[in-house]
């Protein structure tokens, strides 16, 4: 008789999850010499230990502490790029501008990017059928708690000018309920961070509006100013040209507004 299994509303653990995490860890540590000391088997054991045999709606930041410790990595604090709802462009940017880092350019972020995982209370099984959905089931699920933990710590590490890439095509360009709006904004340290500079990425070819005047951007400016951090905003009207100019800044067409 098959054992009764909790049915959650979200997709189950990504197939071949253990192999994927281990392979990503090995690849990352091979590419990044400063992380060569990391024992990837220990990293996987710590990752697994955070959620295996635990109720997937009762995960805490403390559960991830052993993994956080093994993944400790010094990121240049003045080279941090945050993003909200525009991950692909942010990653394309840091692939070109190699001295800047998104969270997914760190070992911990790279390990978990685009993956889903959860376990079951009192069994050592990984649940490949379903995992809790943040809205429909519970917020303290393994994936959400992981991203909240690493996002908070990533924001805490930032200093000087912090950049954030925002999606100008969305109805809420700045969303208070996003990870950026609910976690990262509130964990920037005013003693270290002088300015948050928002880059609003336009979607339409003919879109010449100043999206820095959008009410949600004004809301972000208000939140940031109240935290004694300066705020600035730039429109990126042509993201394709923007990336091209990052690659080839000497190009004559790159002196005009992008």
């Amino acid at each position: 008789v098959p054992r009764w299994r909790q049915q959650w509303s979200g997709p189950g653990t990504t197939k071949r999850f253990p192999e994927t995490v281990l392979a990503r860890c090995v690849k990352y540590t091979e590419i990044h010499p400063e992380m060569r000391h990391v024992d990837c088997q220990s990293v996987w054991d710590a990752f697994k230990g955070a959620f295996i045999s635990k109720h997937p709606c009762n995960i805490t930041e403390e559960d991830y502490q052993p993994l956080m410790k093994l993944g400790t990595q010094t990121v240049p604090c003045n080279k941090i790029l945050l993003w909200s709802r525009i991950k692909d462009l942010a990653h394309q940017f840091t692939q070109v501008q190699r001295d800047m880092f998104t969270l997914e350019d760190t070992l911990l972020g790279y390990l978990a990017d685009d993956l889903t995982w959860c376990g079951e209370f009192n069994t050592s099984k990984i649940n490949y059928q379903s995992c809790p959905d943040w809205r429909k089931d519970c917020s303290n699920n393994p994936v959400s708690v992981f991203w909240k933990t690493v996002s908070r710590r990533f924001a805490e590490a930032a200093c000087d000018v912090v950049h954030v890439m925002l999606n100008g095509s969305r109805s809420k360009i700045f969303d208070k309920n996003s990870t950026f709006g609910s976690v990262e904004v509130h964990n920037l340290q005013p003693e270290k961070v002088q300015t948050l500079e928002a880059w609003v990425i336009h979607g339409g070819r003919e879109d010449s509006r100043d999206l820095c005047q959008d009410p949600t951007i004004k809301e972000l400016e208000s939140i940031i100013s109240k935290r004694n951090i300066q705020f600035s905003c730039k429109n990126i009207y042509r993201p394709d040209k923007f990336l091209q100019c990052v690659k080839n800044p000497e190009d004559s067409s790159c002196t005009s507004e992008i």
């Epitope: 403390e62 502490q65 400790t72 990595q73 010094t74 710590r153 270290k192």
Partner: nanobody
Framework: QVKLQESGGGLVQPGGSLRLSCGAT????????MGWYRQAPGKQRELVAE???????NYADSVKGRFTISRDNAKNTVYLQMNSLNPEDTAVYYC??????????WGQGTQVTVSS
């Protein structure tokens, strides 16, 4: 930059007690792990005890039941209460603070000598 300052070391007789303190100053953010390490002459630095921001602790087998680590998050200070000290505990004791994306910070060390 975070600076760590240890205090409380000294000379103590076998069986005696000491309490070490370590305060973090500078640009303080939410330090995740704080802990104590020690290095005896001619030996490698080893973990004595550590404590997470949430209060979970971890001890070296050799000090379990004798040493207690505690932490005051508001003061960014970590303490090490050392009881039933023996000559093998003689070492320089170093404070460590770590943040996941800012790296690891070390104090200058404080000497603990256990001798009659």
């Amino acid at each position: 930059q975070v600076k760590l300052q240890e205090s409380g070391g000294g000379l103590v007789q076998p069986g005696g007690s000491l309490r070490l303190s370590c305060g973090a100053t500078g640009i303080i953010f939410s330090i995740n792990d704080m802990g104590w390490y020690r290095q005896a002459p001619g030996k490698q630095r080893e973990l004595v005890a550590e404590i997470t921001r949430g209060g979970s602790t971890n001890y070296a087998d050799s000090v379990k039941g004798r040493f207690t680590i505690s932490r005051d998050n508001a003061k960014n200070t970590v303490y090490l209460q050392m009881n039933s000290l023996n000559p093998e505990d003689t070492a320089v004791y170093y404070c460590n603070a770590a943040h996941t994306f800012s790296g690891s910070f070390w104090g200058q060390g404080t000497q603990v000598t256990v001798s009659s």
